[in-house]
Amino acid sequence: HNTTVFQGVAGQSLQVSCPYDSMKHWGRRKAWCRQLGEKGPCQRVVSTHNLWLLSFLRRWNGSTAITDDTLGGTLTITLRNLQPHDAGLYQCQSLHGSEADTLRKVLVEVLADPLDHRDAGDLWFPGESESFEDAHVEHSISRSLLEGEIPFPPTS
C-alpha cells in the first residue's frame, strides 16, 4: 500500500477520505486505527456503526468521527480541533470477522496555525457580515508519499 499524506492546520478540522470498492467490501464494517511504530500494531480509534446498514451514521470517539458511504464506496474520517499529537501514521480498515484489510495508509501532518505566527498588522479580521463561526473550514491537502520517503522518522 502507498501512503497518502493529509495535511491539516492545528486547531482546525481535517477530513480524510478512503475510497474503496463497494462491492468487494459489501457488508463489512470499517475502522480507523493509529499505527504504533513502524512495525507495531494498529490501535483502533473509531469504527463504523455495529449495524452495517447504519454505517452512514456518524460515530464519534473523542474528537475523531467516522462515517461510511457504503453504496458510493467512500469512508470519511474527521479529526476535529487538530493537534500536533494527532500527527502520525493511520490506516483505514475494512473488517471481516477478526481480520482487517487495509483500505488506505494515511500519514497525518499537522501544520502550525499561520495566525499564531503573524504580526498584528498582518492579521485578517472578519468584517461585519463575516465571522469565524459561520465558516466551517475543513482544510485538507493530500498527496502520496514519494518512493523512498518514510512515514516514520528514523529513531536514534
Epitope: W26, G27, H49, N50, L51, W52, L53, L54, F56, L57, R58, R59, W60, T70, L71
Partner: antibody, heavy 126, light 106 residues
C-alpha cells in the same frame, strides 16, 4: 393509504418453524428498509431485525438472540416482507410487528419507524 | 451494548398538566434517539425522531430534547387521548428500547 398487514402467527411447538408475512401497500416498497419487532406479553418492545431497501440488495441485520434462527427476506414484486422463524423457543412468544424505516426527503433513511402493522401473535408452547 | 434507562416507569397526572419523561443512555449516543407512543392493544406510533424532530402529523404538545446521554420527552398539556405507554429507542449501538413509561390520568 399507507398500510402494513402482518399474517402467519399462531401456536407452534418449541423447535418448530413459522413464517410471518408483512404485506405493504400505499408506498413504493423497494425504497424502504423494513423491520421486525416483537413484544412479549406484558413486556416492552424488542427489535428483531431489518432488511435493507432495494439499493442495499436486501442486506439483513439481526438482534443477537435470533441470529442464525430467524431470516428476513422480501419479495419486491408482491410488496411483502417475510420473517422465517426456525428452532423456535418458548421465549420467542410475543406479538410480532413489521414496520417501515423512515426516509428523509433527500433520500437517506433514519432508523425511526413511521408505519407499523397491527401485529400478529406467535405462541411457542408444547 | 447500550442500556436505556427510562423514568419514571409510571406516572399519574391531571388533564392539562405538563408531563416529563426522561431516558438515560449508558453511554453517549449523540442525538440518535426516537420516542414512541403505544396505546393498549395497538402498535407503537412514532412521535419524535433524532431526539427532537416532531414526526409529521403529531400534535405540537409533544416535544423531545437532549443529546449525549440524557434525553427528555415532554407533553406540554396532557390530554385524555395521551393515555399510553411511551418508549425511547436508541440507534447508536443497535436498536435498544427503554423499559417504557405508563401515563395515566388522575
Amino acid at each position: 393509504e399507507v398500510q402494513l398487514v402482518e399474517s402467519g402467527g399462531g401456536l407452534v411447538q418449541p423447535g418448530r418453524s413459522l413464517r410471518l408475512s408483512c404485506t405493504a401497500s400505499g408506498f413504493t416498497f423497494g425504497e424502504y428498509t423494513m423491520s421486525w419487532f416483537r413484544q412479549a406479553p406484558g413486556k416492552g418492545l424488542e427489535w428483531v431485525g431489518f432488511i435493507g431497501s432495494k439499493a442495499y440488495a436486501g442486506t439483513t441485520e439481526y438482534t443477537a438472540s435470533v441470529k442464525g434462527r430467524f431470516t428476513i427476506s422480501r419479495d419486491g414484486s408482491k410488496s411483502i416482507a417475510y420473517l422465517q422463524m426456525n428452532s423456535l423457543k418458548t421465549e420467542d412468544t410475543a406479538v410480532y410487528y413489521c414496520a417501515r424505516g423512515k426516509r428523509y426527503s433527500y433520500g437517506g433513511w433514519v432508523p425511526a419507524f413511521d408505519v407499523w402493522g397491527q401485529g400478529t401473535m406467535v405462541t411457542v408452547s408444547s | 451494548d447500550i442500556q436505556m434507562t427510562q423514568s419514571p416507569s409510571s406516572l399519574s397526572a391531571s388533564v392539562g398538566d405538563r408531563v416529563t419523561i426522561t431516558c438515560q443512555a449508558s453511554q453517549d449516543i449523540t442525538n440518535y434517539l426516537n420516542w414512541y407512543q403505544q396505546k393498549p392493544g395497538k402498535a407503537p406510533k412514532l412521535l419524535i425522531y433524532d431526539a427532537s424532530n416532531l414526526e409529521t402529523g403529531v400534535p405540537s404538545r409533544f416535544s423531545g430534547s437532549g443529546s449525549g446521554t440524557d434525553f427528555t420527552f415532554t407533553i406540554s398539556s396532557l390530554q385524555p387521548e395521551d393515555i399510553a405507554t411511551y418508549y425511547c429507542q436508541e440507534y447508536d449501538s443497535y436498536l435498544a428500547f427503554g423499559g417504557g413509561t405508563k401515563v395515566e390520568i388522575k
